[in-house]
């Protein structure tokens, strides 16, 4: 039996078929017989034999166009219809649904918990170093340094609320002015968007899913970076955020109220506090130059303490330091005085795993980092799997229509603003933008939510996290109320300004276009996603930090040429795409540069060379895990294990073999992969990928 001829696209160039005489091709069963079985026998085929069959009359019924990768996949329901089920089947179906819902909620719970533990792990690994960033005196004079410190600290502690609370306490103790704190808050806003980008990396197994998930996550990054790019210079020039927030704070006579409500934490805290509990004050103390804090552990040992005020004899450097002359004496060498000292008595130890191990913070941090990333990854995979099996047919249609459809004309423009409110509300409920955006990421990946809809939800999330901060500020004690409220308001107005810049006019929604561009690149070269993370969240901030420490002349000396080159490249790029005729022939494309400077292909080759040895064991491991997972879930035989290794697809791309239409493949998952489209595996399809 001859294989299906490759006529999805008529080939004008026969020489393309002459490369490599034989290729292994699976036999496609007769199309008329819609069987579920896959004939897996493979026969060597000489492509040369097919040459005479060049015809524009395609043997496939419909012409196959390459789908827009950003179109949402159709989640087909291949199950038995409800009306066709008997009573037993219906009961079974209901129980299955309930079971899936319970599993979904369970994995979602552990997903959120693992995010919390991940934050704790990052604080243990980099918290003290992060605290030391703040003790740099140049922050006051250099807003750029403040910005990168905000980014780095938030990235290191994986929590914008931690870095913001450090800033608040520093402002309250006059170690930092509100003016100097604003760039740090902007940086913290950028830093917090790394979490959902990390979550998106977990979906790297499926190109198309990853394209959407990564773009959906980085839309947050681009919004924050672009907002800072515009608003930081505006703030430095006009101090509008400082002025507006100061007016608001001064116009109200606030009384500190009740504590900000802990909504999601009420559920997650009982579990996360069994894993680890941190003494967050230590990072703040380091930031405030408290030498004693440098030797303190971040791992909380005593949870129940009794603080008693007692008069204690303490030594002082000189008589001038005495409480009063009559309360001063000497032992012949040292001068002593009596001071009111708060004495902390330890009553009960905490009940977490690490309480009795006495391990260094770094060790605990690394352990928790590995565990939380594994749990995060596992939960995410399971959430995506469960959602994939739930969101089919009617359910999918209803959900997708509800989420992605606009209001009827003329109110269509309101839909996005409603999404912003929903995002803000949801973030307020979960009390964390990281949690909300991280939960959103897999939904974008599997195609439940479009990036166009995810964008306003993310913007809303940014607003939601600031309302939480405002509430927390209103609940703070009198001495920090003013500063914490002003900083929370700065954060709020910064996000509002960002939304006004990058949302109302569709043309200005640059973050969507940029995220899609990055999504496309990352889908093709998946290593680039990690490079993006390292460059944008570590390398650039650390470079700016280093240059800032070297002083303004160095920063300007290096920064100005770099900025000039970036502007030049952007202008050239714009002219190349809009009006290339204006440019000389040589500049109409980037071919005048070495390939490695305008293409990722050579870099990909280099990286493949390095990662090659690790791919095979990784692949095997992945397949085994996937098989176990499929058995546990009761998925179809092959599930999506073929996603783990892209040998076939990447091999074909490398050989220049055209990507085939789905019908010409036996393995449906591979066909979808090749097309850059992902669908939930057909429950009836029996794959033989393993």
């Amino acid at each position: 039996m001859a294989p299906w001829p490759e006529l999805g696209d008529a080939q004008p160039n026969p020489s393309k078929y002459l490369e490599g005489a034989t290729s292994q091709q699976p036999i496609t069963p007769d199309k008329s017989k819609e069987t579920n079985k896959t004939d897996n026998t493979e026969v060597p085929v000489t492509k040369f034999e097919l040459l005479p069959t060049y015809s524009t009359a395609t043997l496939i019924e419909e012409p196959t166009e390459v789908d827009d990768p950003w179109n949402l996949p159709t989640l087909q329901d291949s199950g038995i219809k409800w009306s066709e089920r008997d009573a037993k089947g219906k009961i079974l179906c209901v129980f299955q649904g309930i079971g899936r819902l319970i599993l979904l909620l369970g994995f979602l719970y552990f997903f959120v918990c693992s995010l919390d533990v991940l934050s704790s792990a990052f604080q243990l690994v980099g918290g003290k170093m992060a605290g030391q960033f703040f003790s740099n005196s140049s922050i006051m004079s250099n807003p750029l340094l403040g910005l990168v410190i905000g980014v780095l600290v938030t990235v290191f502690v994986q929590s914008s609320s931690t870095s913001t609370s450090i800033v608040v306490s520093m402002v309250a103790s006059s170690l930092l002015t509100v003016r100097a704190a604003i760039p740090i808050i902007m940086g913290a806003n950028i830093g917090t968007s790394i979490t959902n980008t990390i979550v998106a990396l977990m979906q790297v197994g499926d190109r198309s899913e990853f394209r959407r998930a990564f773009a959906g996550a980085t839309v947050h990054d681009f919004f924050n970076w672009l907002s800072v790019l515009v608003l930081l210079p505006v703030e430095v020039a006009t101090h509008y955020l400082e002025v507006v927030t100061q007016l608001i704070v001064e116009s109200f006579h606030f009384k500190n109220g009740e504590d900000a409500p802990d909504l999601l934490k009420v559920i997650t805290k009982p579990f996360t506090k069994l894993i680890v509990q941190l003494d967050k004050k230590v990072i703040s103390q380091i930031a405030m130059n408290d030498e004693t804090a440098k030797n303190k552990s971040l791992v909380k040992i005593w949870c129940k303490t009794f603080t008693n005020m007692t008069q204690m004899n303490v030594t002082v450097p000189s008589m001038a330091n005495c409480t009063s002359p009559s309360l001063c004496w000497t032992d012949g060498i040292q001068i002593w005085t009596m001071k009111n000292v708060t004495y902390k008595e330890n009553i009960a130890k905490c009940q977490h795993i690490f309480v009795n191990f006495h391990l260094p913070d770094l060790a605990v941090g690394i352990i928790l980092l590995i565990i939380s990333l594994l749990v995060l990854c596992g939960c995410l995979i399971m959430i995506v799997k469960i959602l994939g099996s739930v969101l089919k047919g009617q359910v999918a249609t209803v959900i997708k229509k509800t989420i992605n459809t606009d209001f009827p004309f003329p109110f269509a423009w309101l839909t996005g603003y409603l999404a912003i409110l929903v995002g803000a509300g949801m973030t307020f409920i979960v009390q964390s933008s990281s949690v909300f955006t991280s939960a959103l990421t897999p939904l974008i990946g599997i195609g439940v939510i479009t990036i166009e809809r995810a964008y306003p939800l993310t913007l809303g999330s940014n607003i939601g996290t600031t309302t939480t901060a405002i509430l927390a500020a209103l609940a703070s004690p009198g001495n920090t109320l003013r500063s914490s409220l002003q900083i929370a308001l700065c954060h709020f107005f910064f996000n509002i300004s960002g939304i006004l810049l990058w949302y109302p006019i569709p043309f200005t929604r640059l973050p969507i276009r940029m995220a899609k561009g990055l999504g496309n690149i990352s889908a093709k070269y998946r290593w680039f996603a990690i490079f993006y993370l390292i460059i944008f969240f570590f390398l650039i901030p650390l470079t700016v930090f280093g240059l800032s420490l070297a002083g303004w002349p160095v920063l300007v000396g290096v920064g100005v040429p770099v900025v000039f080159i970036i502007i030049l490249v952007l202008c050239l790029r714009l002219l190349q795409s809009r009006c290339p005729r204006v440019l000389p022939k040589k500049l109409q494309n980037w071919n005048f540069l070495p390939l490695c400077m305008h293409s990722l292909k050579p870099w990909d080759a280099v990286i493949s060379k390095f990662t090659g040895p690790f791919q095979m064991p990784c692949c095997c491991c992945c397949r085994v895990c996937c098989r176990v997972c499929c058995l546990l879930c009761g998925c179809p035989k092959c599930c999506r294990c073929s996603k783990c290794c892209q040998d076939l697809e990447e091999g074909q791309e490398a050989q220049g073999v055209p990507v085939k239409a789905p019908e010409t493949f036996d393995n449906i998952t591979i066909s979808r992969e090749a097309q850059g489209e992902v669908r939930a595996p057909d429950s009836k399809t029996e794959c033989t990928a393993l």
């Epitope: 004899n313 008589m319 002359p325 009559s326 309360l327 001063c328 004496w329 000497t330 032992d331 012949g332 060498i333 040292q334 001068i335 002593w336």
Partner: antibody, heavy 120, light 107 residues
């Protein structure tokens, strides 16, 4: 029990130096400040200075500054006082004493005293 | 330096008498005052510190009081073994200084 045993009596010429010792036992030497007090015949008590053996920190009465040196040898739990440029008015009984009442300058254990006679 | 002036320089009292010795500081010393007893040919012995705290093993007939600049040592009922010279000492400032001493005798 706490014991402070001082070296024997000394007769020295004016302008010379004298170094006396105070060997301790019955307590941890580095814990308490060691004070040196003198008493001229038929006169009152006069504080010379103190040393904290744990760190070697010292404190002197300005009256004796430059003439007195207090040292402590942790290995032998012995304190030393050296007084130079002796004059006839330095004739006195020199006591070493410790204060076990931490943070105070009230001394509660005394050595038996070393009589130093400055005579030409 | 802080001067500690003791009065009287000597006193004679009968057994069972109440004896009071006073000590005046040249400046405020708070309560950083100690009292010592020195019997003839013996080393001084600490009686009281912190103005009124009796040292271990000191009989209850010895008591101290005062604050600031004026301090008092009281022997509520003089005993033959109390014959000695009594010194006050301040430890509020360096150098530590002693009073001139009060010689107590039995009539």
């Amino acid at each position: 029990q706490v014991q402070l045993v001082q070296s024997g009596a000394e007769v020295v010429k004016p302008g010379a130096s004298v170094k006396m010792s105070c060997k301790t036992s019955g307590y941890t030497f580095i814990t308490y400040n060691m004070h040196w007090v003198r008493q001229a015949p038929g006169q009152g008590l006069e504080w010379i200075g103190a040393i904290y053996p744990g760190s070697g920190d010292t404190s002197y009465n300005q009256k004796f500054k430059g003439r007195v040196t207090l040292t402590a040898d942790k290995s032998t739990s012995t304190a030393y006082m050296e007084l130079s440029s002796l004059r006839s008015e330095d004739t006195a009984v020199y006591y070493c004493s410790i204060s076990t009442i931490i943070t105070t300058g009230a001394v509660d254990y005394w050595g038996q005293g070393t009589l130093v006679t400055v005579s030409s | 330096d802080i001067q500690m002036t003791q009065s009287p320089s000597s006193l004679s009292a009968s057994v069972g008498d109440r004896v009071t010795i006073t000590c005046k500081a040249s400046q405020d010393v708070g309560t950083a005052v100690a009292w010592y007893q020195q019997k003839p040919g013996k080393v001084p012995k600490l009686l009281i510190y912190w103005t009124s705290t009796r040292h271990t093993g000191v009989p209850s007939r010895f008591s101290g009081s005062g604050s600031g600049t004026d301090f008092t040592l009281t022997i509520s009922s003089l005993q033959p073994e109390d014959v000695a010279t009594y010194y006050c000492q301040q430890y509020s400032r360096i150098p530590l200084t002693f009073g001139g001493g009060t010689k107590v005798e039995i009539k």
